[in-house]
Amino acid sequence: QHTCSISKVTSLLEVNCENKKLTALPADLPADTGILHLGENQLGTFSTASLVHFTHLTYLYLDRCELTSLQTNGKLIKLENLDLSHNNLKSLPSLGWALPALTTLDVSFNKLGSLSPGVLDGLSQLQELYLQNNDLKSLPPGLLLPTTKLKKLNLANNKLRELPSGLLDGLEDLDTLYLQRNWLRTIPKGFFGTLLLPFVFLHANSWYCDCEILYFRHWLQENANNVYLWKQGVDVKDTTPNVASVRCANLDNAPVYSYPGKGCPTSSGDTDYDDYDDIPDVPATRTEVKFSTNTKVHTTHWSLLAAAPSTSQDSQMISLPPTHKPTKKQSTFIHTQSPGFTTLPETMESNPTFYSLKLNTVLIPSPTTLEPTSTQATPEPNIQPMLTTSTLTTPEHSTTPVPTTTILTTPEHSTIPVPTTAILTTPKPSTIPVPTTATLTTLEPSTTPVPTTATLTTPEPSTTLVPTTATLTTPEHSTTPVPTTATLTTPEHSTTPVPTTATLTTPEPSTTLTNLVSTISPVLTTTLTTPESTPIETILEQFFTTELTLLPTLESTTTIIPEQNSFLNLPEVALVSSDTSESSPFLNSDFCCFLP
C-alpha cells in the first residue's frame, strides 16, 4: 500500500499525504496525481522541480509544512491551485514562469514582510490571492497589474500603513476585497476608480479622519451596501452590510462615513467624490458579549487573527501574540458598540490561553518634575466613565475565536502612584470581586530610575473578598531602586471588606489563572513626567486567562482622559494565539499603532 491515501475527485486522482511526518516528497507518488495534499509535514523547503513529472497536477496543498523557502525552478503547467498557508515564508519567489495556469494562490499566515514588484508577473489567470495574516507593511506599485482576472484579494491582518494609489487599476473582475485589520490611515484619492466591488471589508484600521479622508468618506457613502463586517464562519452573502464598521481612530471611533469634514476645502471631480456633506456623528453604546473560544482539537496552529465572529462588532485593533498554549475556559467581555450593530450574547466552546497584553506607551517628556502626578478626570454631567474597550477576533479560514481585553480603571478614593501613564481598574463594592493581575515594566534602563515591575493582584475568586492593599517593589536587577507604594483602598460601601495583601515582584512565568474585573469605576489617569533627556518607554503588561461571570449591565459611557494625555485614546488591542510565544517583534519601533 502507498504511504498516502488515494481517491478520485472530479476526474482527478487525489493523493493525501497530510500529517505523515514527511521531510521530503514521498517516493511512491502516483504519476497521474491531480490533487496532492502535503500539508502538516515538516518539509522545510520545497522546490517545484520535484513535481515537474506530475503532468496532471492541478491542486497542490503545502499548508503547515514549516516552509521557510520555496523555489520555483520547475514548471507545473497544469497547476491551478497552490496553498502555501500557515508556513514561515518571509519572501516569495517570482511565480509566473513556473505556474502559468495558477488561478488561486494562498500565502496567508506566513511571515511575508514585503513583496517584490514582479512577484506576480506572468500570473495572468490568477483569480484569488490570499495574503492575509502576514507582516506586509507596504505593497509595491503595480503589484497586481499582471493579474487582470483577479476576483478575490485578501490583505487583511497585515501592517499596511498605506496603499499604492493604482493598486486596483484594471481589476475589472474584482468582487471581494479584504483590507480589515491593517494600519491604514487613509485611502488614496481615486483608489477605487470606477470599480463596482460587491464585498469590501475595511474595519479595524487606524482611519484618520481629516480633510484627506473625504474621498474615502464619499466612497463609503456611495457604497454603503457593499461594506461588510467580516464574521468567522459566516458566508458574506449571509450577512448584512455594515458601513458603520469603518471608524475614525482619531474621533472616538465615529464612523468614517459620517465624518462632517467641517472646514475642508471643496472641489469638483466625479471620481474624487468631493461632494462634502455634514452628517452627524453616531454616538457609541456598549453591549455585553458572553462567549468562550474554540479551537480544533487536531491542530496547535494559532495565528494572528483576521476578523470578528458573528457576535462581535469588529472594532479598531492591533493583534498581539500569546505567551502560552490554551486551556479551556468561558469568558465574558465588555464590548464597545455603535448603533447599527446587532451584538447578542453567544456562548462558544473555547480554548483560551494565558495571554500577555502589552500596551506601548511613551512617557511624556517634561523639564519640570520627576515626581508622579495624578490627575482625576472629571466626568461630564450624567456620564459615568467606565471600561469601554474589549473585543474578540477570529481569523479567516479558521475556527479559533480568541478573547481579548484592554484598559482598566481604578475606583474612587483609591490612590495608585504609577510611574507611567496607565489606566488600571479594581472592583467597586461588589459581592463578586474578580481577581486581576497587572504588570508594569520598563523596557530600557533609565538614569531616572522608576520601578520596573509593578503587579497588582487581588484574591482568589470569592463572594466576599475585595482587595485592599498592594505593595509595589522594584525588581532585583534595578541598579537604583526607587520603591513606590500603591494602595488599593476598600470602597466605602463594601459590605464585607476582607483585607488582603499582595506583595508584588517581578512576575515569574505563571500558570495561575487570573481574572479581569467585572465592575468598573471612574477613570483615574496617573502621569509620570520626566526630563526631556530621559524619555522612558514602558509596557503595561496584563497577563490573564479570563472567566468572567455576571457582568453588570453597562450603559453608554465615555472614558475621560486629560487633553495632555490624548494619545492614550487608543485603538483596542487584540490578543491572539500564534505558533510562537516570542513577543520581541512587538517591542520595536514598528509597534506604533496606538498613535493616530
Partner: antibody, heavy 118, light 113 residues
Framework: QVQLVESGGGLVKPGGSLRLSCAAS????????MSWIRQAPGKGLEWVSS???????YYPDSVLGRFTISRDNAKNSLYLQMNSLRAEDTAVYYC????????????WGQGTLVTVSS | DIQMTQSPSSLSASVGDRVTITCKSS????????????LAWYQQKPGKAPKLLIY???TRESGVPSRFSGSGSGTDFTLTISSLQPEDFATYYC?????????FGQGTKVEIK
C-alpha cells in the same frame, strides 16, 4: 468491438482467497482506467476498486487491505486478488471500463459469481 | 461518502407513458471548475450487465435512444423516458462520479402495468 470477459469466480470458504481476471479486447487497454463493481444477489451495485491507466489503484474502505487490483497491459488483462473473504463479499463481480479520466463506466463484462460460504 | 437515494424504488407503467425517476445525492455533484454535474444513469435487465445511458447528468451515450433524457443540478437529478417502450422495462440506477468511492442509487424497477 469492445469486449470484457470475467473469469475466476466460484465457491470459497470465509477467510479464503480468490483471484478474478478480466480479458479485454477491442480497444487500447493501456489507455483506459478499469474497475471492478459487484452486485449481491437481488441487490444494487457496489464499486469495489479501480486502477488508473498509469497503474494507480484505489479502493473503498470496505475492501481496503483485503483486495488488490492490478493490470497487465501486455496481456490486456485486469485482475482482482481477493483475500480474507467474508460472506458479505458474495456477489456477481463485473469488470468495467472508464471513459478517459472520467469515472462512469461505459462498458461492462457479463460478470462472474463469487460465493463465500462455509 | 456520497449517498445516493432513488425514488421510487419501483413503478408500474404502460407502453407510451412518460416515466420520471429521481435521484438525490447527499452532497452537491456540481464541479464549479467546469460547471458539470457528475451523475450517470444505467439500465440493467435481469441476468445482464448494466448499460450506460447518460453521463454528466444529461449527456446521452452514443446509441441510446433520444427518449431517454437526464436533467438536474447540485443534489437533485431526474431521468425521464418520454415514451416508454417495451424494451425499456428494466431496473435503472444512478451513480455519482464526482468523488470516490463511487456510489450508486438502490435502483428503480420499471414494470409493466
Amino acid at each position: 468491438q469492445v469486449q470484457l470477459v470475467e473469469s475466476g469466480g466460484g465457491l470459497v470458504k470465509p477467510g479464503g482467497s480468490l483471484r478474478l481476471s478480466c480479458a479485454a479486447s477491442g480497444f487500447t487497454f493501456s489507455s483506459f482506467a478499469m474497475s471492478w463493481i459487484r452486485q449481491a444477489p437481488g441487490k444494487g451495485l457496489e464499486w469495489v476498486s479501480s486502477i488508473t491507466s498509469a497503474g494507480t489503484p484505489y479502493y473503498p474502505d470496505s475492501v481496503l487491505g483485503r483486495f488488490t487490483i492490478s493490470r497487465d497491459n501486455a496481456k490486456n488483462s485486469l485482475y482482482l486478488q481477493m483475500n480474507s473473504l467474508r460472506a458479505e463479499d458474495t456477489a456477481v463481480y463485473y469488470c468495467a471500463r472508464s471513459r478517459g479520466y472520467e469515472d462512469y463506466f461505459d462498458y461492462w463484462g457479463q460478470g462472474t459469481l463469487v460465493t463465500v460460504s462455509s | 461518502d456520497i449517498q445516493m437515494t432513488q425514488s421510487p424504488s419501483s413503478l408500474s407503467a404502460s407502453v407510451g407513458d412518460r416515466v420520471t425517476i429521481t435521484c438525490k445525492s447527499s452532497q452537491s455533484l456540481l464541479n464549479s471548475r467546469n460547471q458539470k454535474n457528475y451523475l450517470a444513469w444505467y439500465q440493467q435487465k435481469p441476468g445482464k450487465a448494466p448499460k450506460l445511458l447518460i453521463y454528466f447528468t444529461s449527456t446521452r451515450e452514443s446509441g441510446v435512444p433520444s427518449r431517454f433524457s437526464g436533467s438536474g443540478s447540485g443534489t437533485d437529478f431526474t431521468l425521464t423516458i418520454s415514451s416508454l417502450q417495451p424494451e425499456d422495462f428494466a431496473t435503472y440506477y444512478c451513480q455519482q462520479h464526482y468523488s470516490s468511492p463511487w456510489t450508486f442509487g438502490q435502483g428503480t424497477k420499471v414494470e409493466i402495468k
